[in-house]
Each structure stands twice: as structure tokens, then as C-alpha cells.
Interface confidence: medium
Amino acid sequence: QFLKEGQLAAGTCEIVTLDRDSSQPRRTIARQTVKCSCFPGQIAGTTRARPACVDARIIKTKQWCDMLPCLEGEGCDLLINRSGWTCTQPGGRIKTTTVS
């Protein structure tokens, strides 16, 4: 089966837009929009800091860390209001991701 131009293979994702704001010292805010073509029961999410198709139940229950959204060696920590997660690097630097 051939894919039309712009059509994604099932189970894959691509970044559509990526905006970075580095105007604040020691802080970079990035906003990313992705497009995914997921299998039934899956939904767009993040795995190992990259867009990915993940189990839809993870999104429904906001168990973000179950997507394994952080890089290997980083620690995932759910924000208590469940709006997202943090990834803590071994050196202590924290990257926060919020879902909207």
C-alpha cells in the first residue's frame, strides 16, 4: 500500500511546528505541535522525548510518566496537578513539560 504525499505511516509521528522562546534567562520555553497516525487504541504522546503513539489510557488517566517521556537516564516526575511531567537529568537540571 502506497502513502500519499503528506500521509504518515501508521504508528508514526512528525513535528508540525516548533517554536522556541529563549528571552528569559536560564529558561527556554518550547511549544511543539505534532501530527501522528496511530493504531486503534493509541493517541499522540511522547516517548523518550520524541513524539510517539502511546496507549490512549495513559492520556485518559493523565499517567504521563507511563509513556516513558524522558530520555534514558532521566527521572520522570508527574506534576501533582497532572498538567504534565518533569524530566530530571542526572546533574539535577529539570525540564518541565505541560500538556495543553
Partner: antibody, heavy 122, light 110 residues
Framework: AVTLDESGGGLQTPGGALSLVCKAS????????MGWVRQAPGKGLEWVGV????????SYGSAVKGRATISRDNGQSTVRLQLNNLRAEDTGTYFC???????????????WGHGTEVIVSS | ALTQPSSVSANPGETVKITCSGG??????YGWYQQKSPSSAPLTVI????KRPSDIPSRFSGSKSGSTHTLTITGVQAEDEAVYFC??????????????FGAGTTLTVL
């Protein structure tokens, strides 16, 4: 075995402050969110608050919001509850609780401390 | 708030079901906590709907149907006599997600 050992309870005066400490052992402390639950004499369980793994994020129940501060020291495997402007209704047993997964809710507690009793009275 | 019966009773060997309904976060499921006396610490018998700590006997199980969760004790024993609290989360714009517990169900083994 997982153990959670609370300390710092006792007789407190209204308007004063208390500091409770929970010392954890038997698991990788920095990998779990932790919380505090209290129980007034003859009453049910009441959510006090929680803290995430790194200590950067906290949440509190409505009865203590604005008066409570939860902090943690992952190096010492301790979590602390500071409660200011004490009232008689803060009297009860305070339990330290461990979350079972990457977060703690009232549905995911898998271990409890033995509790420390707090009496607020003049 | 969570709703559970104030008391249930059973003979040894019988099956007991304690229900819990309400709460604002069914996706996160329910937990069940046993307290044998007012001065003792709670003990987790079920967390996250149906997970059982390794030291809890297999006669304790949890199940969910719609918005009602049920703790089942199959072949109840005298030592199961206790108060059982269910736990879930509720959401308010003021406090966000906050844990809530039922008022407790007293199980009497006759």
C-alpha cells in the same frame, strides 16, 4: 521491608507551629511521591498533602491549604510536614504515606507509617 | 465525597462485598485501606483498583463496575474484622486534585 517512621508529634498550643518528619527506608526514596494523611480522634482519614519526587511540586488539602508546607530531603530519605497557625481541629494522628507508582493519590498508597499523635490544646 | 456502607457483617468463610462510589477521578481508580483499631495505622489491602500488596492474602480483591468499586473478601476470617476505607481523588478548581476517603465501613465477623 518498606518502613515509614514519623516523629515530631505531641502537645501543641493553638496558634503555634508543628514540624513532623517521616524517615523512610527499604525502598529508593527519590523514586516515589510521598504524602501525609491525618485522622482526628474517632473520625475518618483526611488528605493533608503530597510532594513529588524531586520536591519541586506540592499540593494540599483544603483544611490546611495556606498553613502547610511539605518538603523532602532525598539524601536523608525524609519528608517533612510544617503546619502553622495550629487549631484545635488539627488534633489527630498524622500518617506518612508512600505512592505506589510515579505519583501518589488516595487510590495509590501502598505503604503507611505508624503515625504520630498531635494534640492542639491550651 | 465517597459513599460506602457504614457496616457489614458476615460469618467466617462467607464472601463479603464492600462498595464505594463517587469521587471525581475514576481513571485513577480506587484504593482500600484496613484499620483494625482507631490507634493503629491503616494497612493497604488494594491499591489502584485491583493491585494487592505482596503481604496481603489473595482472599482480598478489588473490582470496578461503572462508577462503583467493590472490595471482595472471599472466605472472610476473624482477623479481617476492621474498618475499611476506600480512597479516590476529587478535583476542585481551588485545590486541584486532592485525595478523598470514604467514611469507613465496619466489618464484623460473627
Amino acid at each position: 521491608a518498606v518502613t515509614l517512621d514519623e516523629s515530631g508529634g505531641g502537645l501543641q498550643t493553638p496558634g503555634g507551629a508543628l514540624s513532623l518528619v517521616c524517615k523512610a527506608s527499604g525502598f529508593t526514596f527519590s523514586s516515589y511521591q510521598m504524602g501525609w494523611v491525618r485522622q482526628a480522634p474517632g473520625k475518618g482519614l483526611e488528605w493533608v498533602g503530597v510532594i513529588n519526587k524531586s520536591g519541586s511540586d506540592t499540593s494540599y488539602g483544603s483544611a490546611v491549604k495556606g498553613r502547610a508546607t511539605i518538603s523532602r530531603d532525598n539524601g536523608q530519605s525524609t519528608v517533612r510536614l510544617q503546619l502553622n497557625n495550629l487549631r484545635a481541629e488539627d488534633t489527630g494522628t498524622y500518617f506518612c504515606a508512600k505512592g505506589s507508582a510515579s505519583y501518589i493519590t488516595a487510590a495509590t498508597i501502598d505503604a503507611w507509617g505508624h503515625g504520630t499523635e498531635v494534640i492542639v490544646s491550651s | 465525597a465517597l459513599t460506602q456502607p457504614s457496616s457489614v457483617s458476615a460469618n467466617p468463610g462467607e464472601t463479603v462485598k464492600i462498595t464505594c462510589s463517587g469521587g471525581g477521578s475514576s481513571g485513577y481508580g480506587y484504593g482500600w485501606y484496613q484499620q483494625k483499631s482507631p490507634s493503629s495505622a491503616p494497612l493497604t489491602v488494594i491499591y489502584w483498583n485491583d493491585k494487592r500488596p505482596s503481604d496481603i492474602p489473595s482472599r482480598f480483591s478489588g473490582s470496578k463496575s461503572g462508577s462503583t468499586h467493590t472490595l471482595t473478601i472471599t472466605g472472610v476470617q476473624a482477623e479481617d474484622e476492621a474498618v475499611y476505607f476506600c480512597g479516590n481523588d476529587d478535583y476542585s478548581s481551588d485545590s486541584g486534585y486532592v485525595g478523598v476517603f470514604g467514611a469507613g465501613t465496619t466489618l464484623t465477623v460473627l
